[in-house]
């Protein structure tokens, strides 16, 4: 599957359980960030702000294109589904121990920024990405990664942190974003919605796919996170979109087949190493990039975002088993563990690909209206 | 940056309580999972108890199940270790450690995957 090439239709559904965009930031002409689904309150609310459910079921996607496993999202139907009456499903912790508001959840109190003041800064992440908008860099080479196909032994941790899972990564996982720009693979984790709610972290042309995977690195200019957090190109992120497709994928299975012994939060396992690289797209040559933060606290920013263009297809059964396997705090279910996207704030977001360029009937005369930031590089 | 300092340790008995906290600087507390060792002479660091970033999930070693509870209370960035039953044993420099989200994801038993830690408060047992 590949990332289509917009047009300007209807962001089709999903919602997020994240929190608000940050007020007071959208200070720049409107073409810099695209019409954003709307979210329940969380992170950046202010009081007397309608707090609208915004939740929308994703339609299906099983159209065939002519390319081999290629899909562009303006063939589907937008479809307009009524919001659910009911509150985003981890909205409400109940902590086993008192009723202590303090600790950080999705889309709902305590605000992030009071957790983290970085969380309202202006260069945040995750954001909307319009192809149309990004500026091709002919300097963004292909992805190289090393050492990422894994023996089945020693094993790998795999754990339920309470907001996510989390796989441990070993020493030895080598990723250059590009000459001089290399990192080490540490853990990967994932981000997702619920029944018939798409829960990426990023959106594209304001869909919302039905999961994410992230995979974070340390810049090797650094020994330890802590040291690079904050830093720009401290950590960098690869991020691939989840999709439904006809067939279970095998490198994904080894994981989530393991998800019902991590039920509880801050439960771990050990499962056998894996082809790390097989949970990414296979085309390492076209993606987006940027640079924003973490998406969940402390929110540091000076984070290397690197996008796929290409989607990972999972069955419809495999999805259901990420999105409800596993536990949060208290009694929650952890679902919905995605960040509102965030405003662009003059940033520009890059593509290794002439991604603004469409064929489509119903592009006009394409124009890319960003240059490259990185030609020189 | 968190920088965490222990308190609470102190010469006791054969069979006391002891309570000690952790505090915290710095307005990520809650992000952190903490967790608490100790360091007998002569001994390596050894794992005691851990909290998830949240305080819904604890673990314990063995050798202090059902004697030790570890707590937390992020509205006061603070986490707590109280020791029933105390045993000569448990005599030790006791270590507050932070562990961020987005470190390696260690075990929580895994000393290497803490990315802070204060400086200790020592917990001497007589018998």
């Known amino acids: 599957q590949r990332l289509p090439r917009m047009q300007e239709d209807s962001p089709l559904g999903g919602g997020s359980s994240g929190e608000d965009d940050p007020l007071g930031e959208e200070d720049l002409p409107s073409e810099e960030d695209s019409p954003r689904e709307e979210d329940p309150p969380g992170e950046e609310d202010l009081p007397g702000e309608e707090d609208l459910p915004g939740e929308e079921d994703l339609p299906e996607v099983k159209p065939k294109s002519e390319e081999e496993g290629s899909l562009k999202l303006e063939d589907l139907p937008t479809v307009e589904a009524p919001g659910d009456p009911q509150e985003p499903q981890n909205n409400a912790h109940r902590d086993k121990e008192g009723d202590d508001q303090s600790h950080w959840r999705y889309g709902g109190d305590p605000p992030w920024p009071r957790v983290s003041p970085a969380c309202a800064g202006r260069f945040q992440s995750p954001v909307d990405i319009r192809p149309q908008l990004a500026a091709f860099c002919p300097a963004l080479r292909p992805l190289e990664l090393l050492g990422f196909q894994l023996p089945p032994l020693p094993e790998l941790r795999l754990r339920n942190n309470g907001h996510s899972v989390q796989l441990t990564l070993p020493p030895g996982l080598e990723m250059a974003l590009g000459p001089g720009r290399e990192y080490r693979a540490l853990q990967l984790h994932l981000h997702w919605g619920a029944a018939g709610r798409p829960g990426s972290e990023h959106t594209v042309e304001g869909h919302r796919f039905p999961a994410e995977i992230h995979v974070v690195h340390l810049s090797t200019a650094f020994a330890r996170v802590d040291e690079a957090l904050g830093r720009p190109g401290g950590l960098a992120v690869l991020a691939a979109f989840l999709e439904e497709g006809p067939e279970e994928n095998s490198a994904y299975e080894q994981l989530l087949s393991r998800l019902e012994e991590i039920a509880e939060e801050g439960s771990e396992t050990q499962v056998p190493g894996l082809d790390i690289s097989a949970l990414l797209p296979s085309d390492f040559s076209r993606y987006f990039q940027y640079e924003g933060s973490l998406t969940t606290p402390p929110c540091a920013q000076g984070v290397i975002w690197t996008v796929f263009n290409q989607t990972v297809m999972l069955s419809a059964k495999q999805l259901h088993t990420l999105s409800d396997t596993l536990w949060g705090p208290g009694d929650s279910r952890l679902q919905l563990n995605f960040r509102a996207t965030q405003p662009l704030n003059g940033r520009v977001i890059e593509a290794s690909f002439p991604a603004g360029v469409d064929s489509s009937p119903r592009a006009a005369e394409p124009v890319q209206l960003n240059s490259c930031l990185a030609a020189g590089d | 940056q968190v920088q965490l300092q222990e308190s609470g340790g102190g010469l006791m008995h054969d069979g006391d309580s002891l309570r000690l906290s952790c505090a915290a600087s710095?307005?990520?507390?809650?992000?952190?999972?903490m967790g608490w060792f100790r360091q007998a002479p002569g001994k390596e660091r050894e794992f005691v108890a851990a909290?998830?970033?949240?305080?819904?999930?604890?673990y314990y070693a063995d050798s202090v199940k059902g004697r030790f509870t570890i707590s937390r209370d992020n509205a006061k960035n603070t986490v707590y270790l109280q020791m029933n039953s105390l045993k000569p044993e448990d005599t030790a420099v006791y270590y507050c450690?932070?562990?961020?989200?987005?470190?390696?994801?260690?075990?929580?038993?895994?000393?290497?995957?803490?990315?802070?830690w204060g400086q200790g408060t020592q917990v001497t047992v007589s018998s």
């Open positions: 450690a932070a562990e961020g989200i987005y470190n390696s994801g260690s075990s929580y038993h895994d000393a290497n995957g803490y990315d802070y």
């Open positions: 909290i998830s970033w949240s305080g819904g999930s604890t």
């Open positions: 710095g307005r990520t507390f809650s992000t952190y999972a």
